[in-house]
Interface confidence: low
């Protein structure tokens, strides 16, 4: 089981207007025609990706400004894995297989990407962080 949904961020957060009008299962949040799960426990990047895939999702693929702002606000001060990783000798890739095209700056020099409200950065993949899954609406 992925675990119960919660918002570990430190700020009060008003739900986006379309969050409650969705086709997402219990414990998932709908936004911009995607369903999101925000974990309440910490895992490594690979373990988090596996947890997402058990539910037909991937670690979050971020492909719009709205998605990015939504996730940063949800993450708050806590670091959350998202679905961007770099294998040696390869470009950054999203967990859906798409190559990353550098539309935002990833700080740090590690292989796995996390976000929080103030930054998108990289960290050693074995570190245990919260994580965010997403998948399209049914």
């Amino acid at each position: 089981s992925v675990g119960q949904y919660n918002c570990p961020g430190q700020y009060t957060f008003s739900m986006p207007s379309d969050s409650h009008v969705s086709s997402c299962s219990e414990d998932w949040v709908g936004y911009q025609r995607k369903c999101y799960f925000i974990s309440t426990v910490k895992r490594s990047w690979t373990s988090a990706q596996n947890a997402c895939s058990e539910h037909g999702a991937t670690l979050a693929v971020i492909d719009s400004e709205k998605d990015m702002n939504f996730l940063k606000r949800y993450a708050g001060r806590e670091e959350h894995w998202v679905g961007l990783k770099k294998e040696p000798g390869h470009p950054w890739k999203w967990s859906n297989g798409k190559e990353f095209n550098n539309w935002f700056n990833v700080t740090g020099s590690d292989k796995c990407v996390f976000l929080k409200n103030t930054e998108v950065s990289s960290m050693e993949c074995e570190k245990n962080l919260y994580w965010i899954c997403n998948k399209p609406y049914k």
């Epitope: 492909d63 719009s64 400004e65 190559e99 990353f100 550098n102 539309w103 700056n105």
Partner: antibody, heavy 106, light 108 residues
Framework: VQPGGSLRLSCAAS????????MHWVRQAPGKGLEWVSS????????YYADSVKGRFTISRDNSKNTLYLQMNSLRAEDTAVYYC??????????WGQGTLVTVSS | DIELTQPPSVSVAPGQTARISCSGD??????VYWYQQKPGQAPVVVIY???KRPSGIPERFSGSNSGNTATLTISGTQAEDEADYYC???????????FGGGTKLTVL
Amino acid sequence: VQPGGSLRLSCAASGFTFSNFVMHWVRQAPGKGLEWVSSISGSSSSTYYADSVKGRFTISRDNSKNTLYLQMNSLRAEDTAVYYCARYYYASFDYWGQGTLVTVSS
Amino acid sequence: DIELTQPPSVSVAPGQTARISCSGDSLGSKYVYWYQQKPGQAPVVVIYGDSKRPSGIPERFSGSNSGNTATLTISGTQAEDEADYYCQSYTSFTTKIVFGGGTKLTVL
């Protein structure tokens, strides 16, 4: 401008936080398609160039003036084109300048 | 570097569906963007991230991308859709932008 000459293009931006955005130059020769020329990160720490202009063109920006520049040296006839500056936002060019025609001819 | 190939021209009757292809090696592993350009004007993005429409772009514009081919589809084509269309992608290692050669869409 004559072949071998130099020219500096500028692009003044407004309405957004200029320093937060990667900016690009894209050109279009008369009757031809779009050709990417160069890009620069928000802090100017990274710059990239098309092979066709590398070593001749230099992209720069002044965030205090919200202005993007393209210094073009050793100009050739094949550099004749409309040059557009464009904002790169979530991997597409969402705002473009109106374009400026550069003609290289003797 | 990736090269993007588009047909030089596509013709369609008003109200019919126009499809413009863009092919490149393993293009499906990258995001593709589509721009519309009318004479004397700067390009306008009509599809980003393979299949997403910016606000203000009519629903008749849609996109897909898999394998080696991306496709821009215009359903119920209107006279005002007559323009040049360019696909765009990128090279991940060098952050270089690549455009297709452009397709002139004629609405008969």
